[in-house]
Interface confidence: medium
Amino acid sequence: EVEKTACPSGKKAREIDESLIFYKKWELEACVDAALLATQMDRVNAIPFTYEQLDVLKHKLDELYPQGYPESVIQHLGYLFLKMSPEDIRKWNVTSLETLKALLEVNKGHEMSPQVATLIDRFVKGRGQLDKDTLDTLTAFYPGYLCSLSPEELSSVPPSSIWAVRPQDLDTCDPRQLDVLYPKARLAFQNMNGSEYFVKIQSFLGGAPTEDLKALSQQNVSMDLATFMKLRTDAVLPLTVAEVQKLLGPHVEGLKAEERHRPVRDWILRQRQDDLDTLGLGLQGGIPNGYLVLDLSMQEALS
């Protein structure tokens, strides 16, 4: 807290300019009018105040706007944003994407801070949903943003926003998140032709059910092993050897290198050995010839 002291004669600030960087903290407090500061916030970005001086300027704005800063001030906070606490930011009502971009720019190159997370939360809640432009902006600054959301939060993403998602944005998503995103992606890309559709949907396939994988196997998509290994195990298990062969196309020989890893390992255990042998890859561990395979799930459904 800066003590209230009278401004020395001739030092009253008429505008926010370079002379203020030589003011002591108490002089800034005494000589800079908060309303003047609010209207000339854009200048603060360009004048290299010390971090301690910024504390004083923040204090003045806090006194002027105890209920939270107006967006006209927020948009021009610049590096003063780094001084804000999550509690400060929760008082704000940020509606402009330009304001969001301006503040994310300040934090660019750094990890997502609690301040930024709070800012994004306030912005998205204010908009009601994660629209395409917002998602575009957030993933540009933080590629992992989408995967930091809970499945419940992801449910508010409209299918139209999925067009903004790049493959790298999904790198850290877990299966529960992909379960939510996949149906949205399927809806978003439904009018595309086969090969174009596959290129777009590929990153989301970790949330695809068996029937969709079966359908893809009929379309000569040549799925790569990296994508196959990210599929849900429960979605892969019911696929036949012929379906997996069609799904992977020339990449099928990569199964040998992955035979000890899920979902390939579990899938092999469900296939007849003679079917696996048709692949000519030397995959072992299938059901020996002559054994009867009981589909227990079907049996339970009938009883």
């Epitope: 360009a46 290299p48 010390t50 971090y51 610049g78 590096y79 780094l82 720019e105 190159g109």
Partner: nanobody, 118 residues
Framework: EVQLVESGGGLVQPGGSLRLSCAAS????????MGWFRQAPGKGRELVAS????????YYPDSVEGRFTISRDNAKRMVYLQMNSLRAEDTAVYYC???????????WGQGTQVTVSS
Amino acid sequence: EVQLVESGGGLVQPGGSLRLSCAASGSISDLYAMGWFRQAPGKGRELVASINSFSDITYYPDSVEGRFTISRDNAKRMVYLQMNSLRAEDTAVYYCAARMIKKGFDYWGQGTQVTVSS
């Protein structure tokens, strides 16, 4: 620690031009602004130009507005001051300075002399 080294000063005639350079080294990931200051004999230090590190926002006092231009090259860790239409009153030692995000410390170069005289 941040080290700043200026170069490009010298003697120039009124109306002439000079380009000052400042090379930054050390821990500059938290840099938020860089500026050029000057100090004439018997006078205090004055800011003549500054540039924000996260955008291209620049600032100039009225005394140099339109004549001086500050720019930066992040890849080379350089900051430049292009000075045109120089006047006798621009004679001073020019210092490059840096301010950091996380601290209130200033980092200063050693300075480079600029003399404007016929």
